[in-house]
């Protein structure tokens, strides 16, 4: 059976989330999408959202974050450049489908951005080091103003995801640390 | 360890379909993305698509889009790539392979490899 | 789909020479990259991944660098064992595709 997992990405402030949810090609290649945070107590909010329909592998930027939908494969990437203390909080993407619910999709996002230098990235055997800059030509999406009422928040153990920025480009390293956790099955 | 392993070879008629089996073993199994890659005799290698093992959704490029179809079986960890239509073009090695990091992070560095499928088409 | 150049496409060095191989993206792939060795009968092997990370495992004598379309690919010092073919990837967007390799083999 399908579980519904939090993955927990452990960031420094000015580093990236680079991650991808996947949805069923044949039911959502052309939905819209979005990537909302869900934070205690509260609805998710949207915070970015393709365009509708969603266009093929097209780079939509709403402030620091950029959607790409590559709907031939079935895979929403999202990417969130310097990142802030702020930013920590659960992620979910999920599929716009009016006038029924969002379709949330696995899995979520348990992002913890905190102070401190990101240098180098260090010899950890699962250091990565993926720079890359933000795309010139980007489309700002306007997003459906309604939320989901799902809220699970449940916060898992500890892990480390390092990344670093050098300059204004972004480096991602160590995201195969990130740790899994049922929220619930 | 990390052990990804394959079914054995097979030889099929032109327009027949194979199914290849992937047991993974040594890790979390829903965790991590198998990739599909073939390579053909003497010839490079070819990715052909993914599949989420948790979710079950599946992704594959175009040139094989039609034809193939990507499942698993979560409870003996298991993944299936099926070709149908077979041409002898697609006679190759065809490889599973789980990704270096967990199904949300976006990298796509093919870390563990099984020993391959020699599927063979012939009339 | 981003094309992925490889040269030279074989090549025939000496035991302890400083072997380079290079890949070059159709587009800026930033360092989306990562190169395998694959030995004749066996499946690929993750050498380098993101450009310059060395797999966990992997002799210090290899090495990769490079960014946006140009990479390359060193042993510092070929050793026997070597003897392979090399491919470079890159996953800057989907489809994911590879060059077309390098045969590397001893004079």
């Known amino acids: 059976a399908t579980k519904l997992t939090e993955e927990k990405y452990e960031l420094k402030e000015g580093q990236t989330l680079d991650v991808k949810c996947d949805y069923t090609l044949e039911k959502f290649a052309s939905s819209q999408k979005a990537w909302q945070i869900i934070r205690d107590g509260e609805m998710p909010k949207t915070l970015a959202c393709t365009e509708r329909p969603s266009k093929n592998s097209h780079p939509v930027q709403v402030g620091r974050i950029i959607l790409e939908d590559y709907h031939d494969h079935g895979l929403l990437r999202v990417r969130m450049v310097n990142l802030q203390v702020e930013d920590s909080g659960l992620y979910q993407c999920v599929i716009y489908q009016p006038p029924k619910e969002p379709h949330m999709l696995f899995d979520r996002i348990r992002l913890v951005v905190t102070k401190g230098f990101s240098g180098t990235p260090g010899s950890n055997e699962n250091s990565t080091q993926n720079v890359y800059k933000i795309p010139p030509t980007t489309t700002k999406a306007l997003c459906p103003l309604y939320t989901s009422p799902r809220t699970v928040t449940q916060a898992p153990p500890k892990s480390t995801a390092d990344v670093s920025t050098p300059d204004s480009e972004i480096n991602l390293t160590n995201v195969t640390d990130i740790i899994r956790v049922p929220v619930f099955n | 360890q990390v052990q990804l392993v394959q079914s054995g070879a097979e030889v099929k008629k032109p327009g027949a379909s194979v199914k290849v089996s992937c047991k993974a073993s040594?890790?979390?199994?829903?965790?991590?993305?198998i990739n599909w890659v073939r390579q053909a005799t003497g010839q490079g290698l070819e990715w052909m698509g993914w599949?989420?093992?948790?979710?079950?959704?599946?992704g594959s490029v175009k040139k094989f889009r039609d034809r193939v179809t990507m499942t698993r079986d979560t409870s003996i960890s298991t993944a299936y790539m099926e070709l149908s239509s077979l041409r002898s073009e697609d006679t190759a090695v065809y490889y599973c392979?789980?990704?270096?990091?967990?199904?949300?992070?976006?990298?796509?560095?093919?870390?563990?490899w099984g020993q391959g499928t020699l599927v063979t088409v012939s009339s | 789909d981003i094309q992925m150049t490889q040269s030279p496409s074989s090549l025939s060095a000496s035991v302890g020479d400083r072997v380079t191989i290079t890949c070059q993206a159709s587009?800026?792939?930033?360092?989306?990259l990562n190169w395998y060795q694959q030995k004749p009968g066996k499946a690929p092997k993750l050498l380098i991944y993101?450009?310059?990370n060395l797999e966990t495992g992997v002799p210090s004598r290899f090495s990769g660098s490079g960014s946006g379309t140009d990479f390359t690919f060193t042993i510092s010092s070929l050793q026997p064992e070597d003897i392979a073919t090399y491919y470079c990837?890159?996953?800057?967007?989907?489809?994911?595709?590879f060059g077309q390799g390098t045969r590397l083999e001893i004079k």
């Open positions: 993101d450009a310059s």
């Open positions: 587009r800026d792939i930033s360092k989306y």
């Open positions: 040594g890790y979390t199994f829903t965790s991590y993305d």
């Open positions: 392979v789980r990704l270096i990091g967990y199904s949300s992070a976006y990298k796509w560095s093919f870390q563990h």
């Open positions: 599949m989420n093992p948790n979710s079950g959704n599946s």
């Open positions: 990837q890159h996953y800057d967007n989907i489809p994911i595709t």
